[in-house]
């Protein structure tokens, strides 16, 4: 047993058939020796008497907030929630696995720059009761700070049948170094907390491998005189880091047909322009990426030709 | 693999025009990004236009932009680079260039597969 924050503790329990649990020692936080009662939730039945209170824990029913009394005042609350190792694996039944860069995804992270300043995300199909919280640092054994913020619900999704819920959280980090060669990664790690089990999640990554920048900016077409031609330019995104001379992007540009049977072209470029042939109809997109490491792609920036 | 072979040089006085062409063997000719380079004498080998595989995408150097149309036909295996308004500077040879996924503006090493170069004089 071990204590998750104040009065909140997490039993860790071998989950199978008739295991034996976890015996758990409870103790009343006051002065007072004696006429102490100890119930569960919301039930009255006294549990047991006196300032410690002894449990077996083998299942959710005997997890929930243990509260001691005297002549009917409440003295203090120790809530205990359940974490399952199945088969030696801890279990992970409240978030979704992502299967994105590969099985097992639970957290996602992208950073849009080298400012130290990333997003985590992961999936849901519980609404209710569900709790999250987030630290992270770099390096474990001896950690360098990051401060996330609150895991907030950013989008609801129908699939299929059920609902999916996206939470995200930002973390930046402390004392972050753009151009530093980094040797340690970041740790994010996510406790989740739904009714009475308690689930943790891990992620473990450099900036450089997270990085995904915002799609190019001021995607424009200019018609070149006398010509079918048009000539293309775009800049950099906003959120991208500067100096854009060391922070350098590649380009890919890509010009599709109006069917999608149509062959796409597409070529890839340090310029921030192009020349076109503008067929009608066509559309013409460009995506971003770090020039000298090859994390993601931005998303595209599209135009239409017309 | 495809290989290249450059006709259409010649001299010519400023202000003139030139077609140079660049003719290419094998099948995957359609497969490639086609580049027009050039390397005057004494100076390092620079990028002049390059185009798209299917020809609808290209660029230009600042310095020939308005002046140096790329084109290419696939059917015929060629690529072109109509030349106009020549200047005594644009006296060079000139190289026709063949690379399945370069990164335009990076230059030469982007490119695996080379032409013999045709030479090209402007005059004044």
């Known amino acids: 047993i071990w204590e998750l924050k104040k009065d909140v503790y997490v039993v860790e329990l071998d989950w199978y058939p008739d295991a034996p649990g976890e015996m758990v020692v409870l103790t009343c936080d006051t002065p007072e020796e004696d006429g102490i009662t100890w119930t569960l939730d919301q039930s009255s039945e006294v549990l047991g008497s006196g300032k410690t209170l002894t449990i077996q824990v083998k299942e959710f029913g005997d997890a929930g907030q243990y509260t001691c009394h005297k002549g009917g005042e409440v003295l203090s609350h120790s809530l205990l929630l359940l974490h399952k190792k199945e088969d030696g694996i801890w279990s992970t039944d409240i978030l979704k696995d992502q299967k994105e860069p590969k099985n097992k995804t639970f957290l996602r992270c992208e950073a849009k720059n080298y400012s130290g300043r990333f997003t985590c995300w992961w999936l849901t199909t519980i609404s209710t009761d569900l709790t999250f919280s987030v630290k992270s640092s770099r390096g474990s054994s001896d950690p360098q700070g990051v401060t996330c913020g609150a895991a907030t619900l950013s989008a609801e999704r129908v699939r299929g049948d059920n609902k999916e819920y996206e939470y995200s959280v930002e973390c930046q980090e402390d004392s972050a170094c753009p151009a530093a060669e980094e040797s340690l990664p970041i740790e994010v790690m996510v406790d989740a907390v739904h009714k009475l089990k308690y689930e943790n999640y891990t992620s473990s990554f450099f900036i450089r491998d997270i990085i995904k920048p915002d799609p190019p900016k001021n995607l424009q077409l200019k018609p070149l005189k006398n010509s079918r031609q048009v000539e293309v330019s775009w800049e950099y995104p906003d959120t991208w880091s500067t100096p854009h001379s060391y922070f350098s992007l590649t380009f890919c540009v890509q010009v599709q047909g109006k069917s999608k049977r149509e062959k796409k072209d597409r070529v890839f470029t340090d310029k921030t322009s192009a020349t076109v042939i503008c067929r009608k109809n066509a559309s013409i997109s460009v995506r971003a990426q770090d020039r000298y490491y090859s994390s993601s792609w931005s998303e595209w920036a599209s135009v239409p030709c017309s | 693999e495809v290989q290249l072979v450059e006709s259409g040089g010649g001299l010519v006085q400023a202000g003139g025009s030139l077609r140079p062409s660049c003719a290419a063997s094998g099948r995957t000719f359609s497969n490639y990004n086609m580049g027009w380079f050039r390397q005057a004498p004494g100076k390092e080998r620079e990028s002049v236009a390059t185009?798209?595989?299917?020809?609808?995408?290209?660029d230009y150097a600042d310095s020939v932009k308005g002046r140096f149309t790329i084109s290419r036909d696939n059917a015929k295996n060629t690529v072109y680079l109509q030349m106009d308004s020549l200047k005594p500077e644009d006296t060079a040879v000139y190289y026709c260039?063949?690379?399945?996924?370069?990164?335009w503006g990076r230059g030469p090493d982007e490119y695996d597969t080379w032409g013999q170069g045709t030479q090209v004089t402007v005059s004044s």
């Open positions: 185009i798209s595989r299917s020809g609808v995408i290209t």
């Open positions: 260039a063949a690379a399945r996924s370069p990164v």
